[in-house]
C-alpha cells in the first residue's frame, strides 16, 4: 500500500528543503528565504525561528532545519529548545515577581538561578556547626560535641555531598 | 504570527518625558503578564518593569521607581512605560516581553521579545 501511494502521489519525492506545490502541478520548490523542511514530502515550509530581543542565534536556519536560539548573557534556557530565557540572579539572591531578591536568614543560593534553600541543620545528623552559613553558602557541619571531648579526634570525614535541593529541612 | 512591536523611542533631553507603546498581535494578550528590559550600550540587558495580566500587580528596577510608571490596555492589546525625569542613564534600547506561559507559579521566564525601541537622553 506504502509503495501505491508513493507511486500516486509525487509529493512524496519531494525531500527535506523543499515543499510540494500545489499552484505548480505538485512540482518540488524550494523553500523561500526564513523557512525550512525537515522532512520529505511537506507541502508547505514551515518559518523559521527568529532569535530577537533576549534571545540570540545559536544556529542559523537552513533550509531543512529551523534556527536554534540561547540566551544573551545575564540569561539563562527554559523549557524545551530554549522556549524561554530567565534573568539570572547573583549568589546569594533568587528571583523573584519584583526582580532578584537577597536570600532570606538561613537560606542560601550559591548558583545564579534557581531559589534560595535552608542550611543545613547539622543537628539532624548529630552533628554541629564547624562553619556558619551565608546567603551564598550552606553551613558546614563538623564533629558532634561527643566527638570533641578529650581524646577524640578533632575531624570526621566529611559526609557525602547532599545533591542540590536535598539538604534537610 | 506572535508579535510585539515597539514604538515611542527617541532623543530627549535629561528630565524630560517619554511614553513607550508596545503593540501585541496574534495572541491572548490579556492572559499574559508583561514586561519591559532595556540594554544600555556595552552593558548587559536589564529588568526595568513586569506587570501582571490585569494591572494590579507592578513592580520595578530600584533606579526607575517613582520615575517610571509602567501600565497596559487590554481593550487595545498595548503596554505601555511612561518615563519620566529622564537621566543619561536610561539611554537605551528597551525591549517589550511576554512572560512565559505558567509565568510566577512555575518560572520567571520570558519567550516572545520585540525589536526594541531606541531611548537617548541627551543635552
Known amino acids: 500500500f506504502e509503495r501505491t501511494r508513493s507511486l500516486q502521489d509525487p509529493c512524496s519525492n519531494c525531500p527535506a528543503g523543499t515543499f510540494c506545490d500545489n499552484n505548480r502541478n505538485q512540482i518540488c520548490s524550494p523553500c523561500p528565504p526564513n523557512s525550512f523542511s525537515s522532512a520529505g514530502g511537506q507541502r508547505t515550509c514551515d518559518i523559521c525561528r527568529q532569535c530577537k530581543g533576549v534571545f540570540r542565534t545559536r544556529k542559523e536556519c537552513s533550509s531543512t532545519s529551523n534556527a536554534e536560539c540561547d540566551c544573551t548573557p545575564g540569561f539563562h534556557c527554559l523549557g524545551a529548545g530554549c522556549s524561554m530565557c530567565e534573568q539570572d540572579c547573583k549568589q546569594g539572591q533568587e528571583l523573584t515577581k519584583k526582580g532578584c531578591k537577597d536570600c532570606c536568614f538561613g537560606t542560601f543560593n550559591d548558583q545564579k538561578r534557581g531559589i534560595c534553600r535552608p542550611w543545613t541543620n547539622c543537628s539532624l545528623d548529630g552533628k554541629s556547626v564547624l562553619v556558619n552559613g551565608t546567603k551564598e553558602r550552606d553551613v558546614v557541619c563538623g564533629p558532634s560535641p561527643a566527638d570533641l571531648s578529650p581524646g577524640a579526634s578533632s575531624v570526621t570525614p566529611p559526609a557525602p555531598a547532599r545533591e542540590p535541593g536535598h539538604s534537610p529541612q | 504570527e506572535v508579535q510585539l512591536v515597539e514604538s515611542g523611542g527617541g532623543l530627549v533631553q535629561p528630565g524630560g518625558s517619554l511614553r513607550l507603546s508596545c503593540g501585541a498581535s496574534?495572541?491572548?494578550?490579556?492572559?499574559?503578564?508583561m514586561f519591559w528590559f532595556r540594554q544600555a550600550p556595552g552593558k548587559e540587558l536589564e529588568w526595568v518593569a513586569n506587570?501582571?495580566?490585569?494591572?494590579?500587580?507592578?513592580y520595578y528596577v530600584d533606579s526607575v521607581e517613582g520615575r517610571f510608571t509602567i501600565s497596559r490596555d487590554n481593550a487595545k492589546n498595548s503596554l505601555y512605560l511612561q518615563m519620566n525625569s529622564l537621566r543619561a542613564e536610561d539611554t537605551a534600547i528597551y525591549y517589550c516581553?511576554?512572560?512565559?506561559?505558567?509565568?510566577?507559579?512555575?518560572?520567571?521566564?520570558?519567550?516572545?521579545w520585540g525589536q526594541g525601541t531606541t531611548v537617548t537622553v541627551s543635552s
Open positions: 516581553a511576554r512572560g512565559g506561559e505558567g509565568y510566577s507559579d512555575s518560572h520567571y521566564g520570558t519567550d516572545v
Open positions: 506587570v501582571n495580566q490585569n494591572g494590579s500587580e507592578k
Open positions: 496574534g495572541f491572548t494578550f490579556s492572559n499574559y503578564w
